[in-house]
């Protein structure tokens, strides 16, 4: 009969290298009597006999990992014990070798110029793969802005337009190489105005072209704003070349305005905008009427048909390229403005404006416009439209107009001839005479002017009913 013998491990465990999904075997040869009981641990945790991932054979002396996973690496020990003497142990490492694998590949990125971009590239592999990057067809060189992080991710500081392109990461170790798919880095650039529109001071009826050039990625859109609202008239021509948009707004100038060019582009859910403004001012209408040349002809427009005396000849100012058209458009613009004034003021203002813009004309050797009589002008200003006129003058002092009579080509009453001096030198407004017959009272008005300036129309021919403040003496 054999003598009892304590276990001795005759083949110590060694380090085993294994590829993922391959078989790995540890051998633990033991000499002892009686036959020992052999158990296995991984990282000091007992491996259960019924774990189907393992096969334990040869009385426990052979441990086989049937399909190695990357999580199987660690220290494997066999422990032999037969009750004679102490248990013996031998340990060896399992090094799971792994071809490179990209576990978190890069994705398409849109980034705004100047910000930091990070393209991820997380890898697995044993030996640990080295990560490099390719841009387009060339290996990407690191520099002060561009670095490959320890994690494998690509970090680009202060992204520039030239950083845009297609990128892929490459993971490499002794067992192989893995490539990510190509991803696109798009560099977006905030809209920026390269050329702002220029301000103009022009005569009424002129054509003006405002030009605005902007750049950005994506290419910006350009919109135009007139005095805070979308431009209602004029034609816009646009062209795009090399990410630069050129917008030209052609305007037929009938009123002063602040024109703003707004360049906008979209970055995800956010927009970037750039603005530039220009003013278009009009050389004063009354000045352009002075010393003006023109011709007398019948009015054939639409707006003043019902207001002007039938078959009267009116003055057309040839300082305009197309006098008929320019004056008609000005009166059309003026009438639109009059929508905002009171029912008392509007017809009187219409009569004043039509007769001021289309002055009666004496077709002599030198065609001569006949201005409105001062008294009628003052009647409109200080009686029919007193409230509107005051509001307009207040706005004029503040330098900005919004609505009402501010854009109207109204005459300066004080500079008009008086019908008391020469009744044939000026034009009367029949509408105001007609009102005398139909209106008995007017709202009381406190005049801001001395009483000497108050209109004083002869009752017999051309007068109108007035409030007590306007005596008809």
């Amino acid at each position: 009969e054999k003598l009892p013998k304590a276990p001795v491990i005759t083949t110590p465990l060694e380090t085993v290298d294994a590829l993922v999904e391959e078989v790995a075997t540890f051998m633990c040869a033991v000499e002892s009597y009686p036959q020992p009981e052999i158990s296995w641990t991984r990282n000091k945790i007992l491996i259960k006999l019924f774990d189907t991932r393992y096969s334990i054979r040869e009385n426990g002396q052979l441990l086989t990992i049937l399909s190695v996973e990357d999580s199987d690496d660690g220290i494997y020990c066999c422990i032999a014990n037969n009750g004679v003497g102490g248990a013996v142990e031998s340990c060896g490492a399992l090094q799971v070798k792994m071809k490179p694998k990209i576990t978190r590949p890069p994705i398409n990125v849109k980034i705004i110029e100047g910000l930091k971009a990070v393209l991820p590239c997380t890898t697995m592999g044993n030996p640990k793969p080295s990560v490099s990057w390719i841009k387009g067809d060339n290996a990407l060189r690191e520099n002060s802005r561009i670095a490959v992080l320890e994690s494998g991710s690509l970090r680009i500081h202060n992204v520039q337009k030239e950083d845009a392109g297609q990128y892929r990461c490459v993971a490499k170790n002794s067992l192989g190489t893995a490539y990510s798919k190509l991803v696109k880095l798009e560099v977006e650039v905030f809209a920026r105005i390269l050329r702002a529109p220029e301000s103009h001071n022009v005569t009424f009826g002129s054509f003006v072209t405002l030009r605005c050039t902007a750049i950005g990625i994506p290419v910006p859109t350009i919109s135009w704003i007139e005095n805070g609202n979308a431009v209602s008239s004029g034609s816009i021509q646009e062209s795009v070349k090399d990410r630069v948009i050129d917008s030209r707004l052609q305007l037929f100038i009938t009123k002063p305005g602040l024109y703003t060019c707004i360049a906008t582009n979209k970055h995800g859910e956010k927009f970037s905008t750039a603005k530039a403004a220009a003013t278009v001012s009009i050389a004063e209408w009354s000045k352009s009427q002075k010393d003006s040349q023109g011709y007398c002809a019948q009015y054939r427009g639409e707006v003043c048909d019902a207001v002007l005396a039938k078959d009267a000849l009116v003055f057309f100012n040839t300082s305009y390229r197309d006098p008929e058209d320019a004056q008609e458009l000005l009166i059309h613009t003026a009438w639109n403005e009059l929508k905002a004034v009171s029912p008392l003021c509007r017809p009187a203002a219409e009569a004043l404006l039509c007769n001021h813009l289309f002055q009666e004309c004496s077709p002599g050797v030198v065609p001569t416009p006949m201005p409105i009589c001062r008294e009628y002008c003052l009647a409109v200003k200080e009686l029919f439209c007193a409230k509107e006129w005051q509001a307009m003058e207040g706005k004029a002092h503040r330098g900005l107009y919004r609505s009402g009579m501010h854009l109207l080509p109204v005459p300066e009453c004080s500079k008009l001839p008086s019908m008391h001096r020469d009744p044939t030198a000026c034009t009367r407004l029949p509408y105001l005479d007609y009102k005398k017959e139909n209106i008995t009272t007017f709202p009381s008005i406190t005049s801001s002017r001395p009483s000497a300036d108050i209109p004083n129309l002869p009752a017999s021919t051309s007068s109108f009913a007035v409030s007590p403040a306007y005596s008809m003496t």
């Epitope: 034609s235 037929f252 011709y295 007398c296 002809a297 019948q298 009015y299 054939r300 427009g301 639409e302 048909d305 019902a306 039938k310 078959d311 000849l313 197309d322 008929e324 058209d325 008609e328 458009l329 059309h332 077709p363």
Partner: antibody, heavy 121, light 113 residues
């Protein structure tokens, strides 16, 4: 290039209706007055109707008043002439013409090639 | 309704000068009638020559000029060319208010012999 192209002409019986259209291109349509002018076979020109830039007024030759309606759609850059109760004397080539300015009346500085309207039983 | 009158036909030698006139059956033509002149060659649409008495449309040769002479509007061709052979129409603006009218004359057939 400025173009005016008329369409909608054809043969119609007396008392019938036609709608002529004039498609404009190559200029800012809503900055100009427009007119319809007709020319009977072998005859002279005859103004029919006019409309200013904004469509705010309409004007007609006395003989077509109440039967013809001029209109414009500035968004579509199109001028129209709706002709009802047509008579044999309305037979003509109908020209669409552009004014040199905004108001309805004045020189017609661009013309279409015309569309023939024949009123016959 | 006023009738606009024109010479039915006129002839001119190449290089010669010819004046076409445009009158009113009742009254005189004035600048308030804004006389306009058109040229039409066979099978073609009319072409604007002169507007508002004496203004030439763009592209119109300087040999064409307009005026008011006496009580009529006039179109003068100075140094006529063979290509000037055509029908010439004058048109006058009439009326006010809703009675505005634009009346063409019967046309003048110009022959360049």
């Amino acid at each position: 290039e400025l173009q005016l192209v008329e369409s909608g002409g054809g043969l119609v019986q007396p008392g019938g209706s036609l709608r002529l259209s004039c498609a404009a291109s190559g200029f800012t349509f809503d900055d100009y007055g427009m007119s319809w002018v007709r020319q009977a076979p072998g005859k002279g020109l005859e103004w029919v109707s006019a409309i200013p830039w904004n469509g705010g007024s309409t004007y007609y030759k006395e003989s077509v008043k109440g039967r013809f309606t001029i209109s414009r759609d500035n968004a579509k850059k199109t001028l129209y002439l709706q002709m009802n109760s047509l008579k044999s004397e309305d037979t003509a080539v109908y020209y669409c013409a552009k004014r040199s300015g905004r108001i309805a009346f004045g020189a017609l500085d661009a013309w279409g090639q015309g569309t023939l309207v024949t009123v016959s039983s | 309704q006023a009738v606009v009158t024109q010479e039915p036909s006129l002839s001119v030698s190449p290089g010669g000068t010819v004046t076409l006139t445009c009158g009113l059956s009742s009254g005189s033509v004035t600048s308030s009638n804004y006389p306009d002149w058109y040229q039409q060659t066979p099978g073609q649409a009319p072409r604007a020559l002169i507007y508002s008495t004496n203004s030439r449309h763009s592209g119109v040769p300087s040999r064409f000029s307009g005026s008011i002479s006496g009580n009529k509007a006039a179109l003068t061709i100075t140094g006529a060319q063979p290509e000037d052979e055509a029908d010439y129409y004058c048109a006058l603006y009439m009326g006010r208010g809703s009675n505005k009218d634009y009346v063409f004359g019967g046309g003048t057939k110009l022959t360049v012999l």
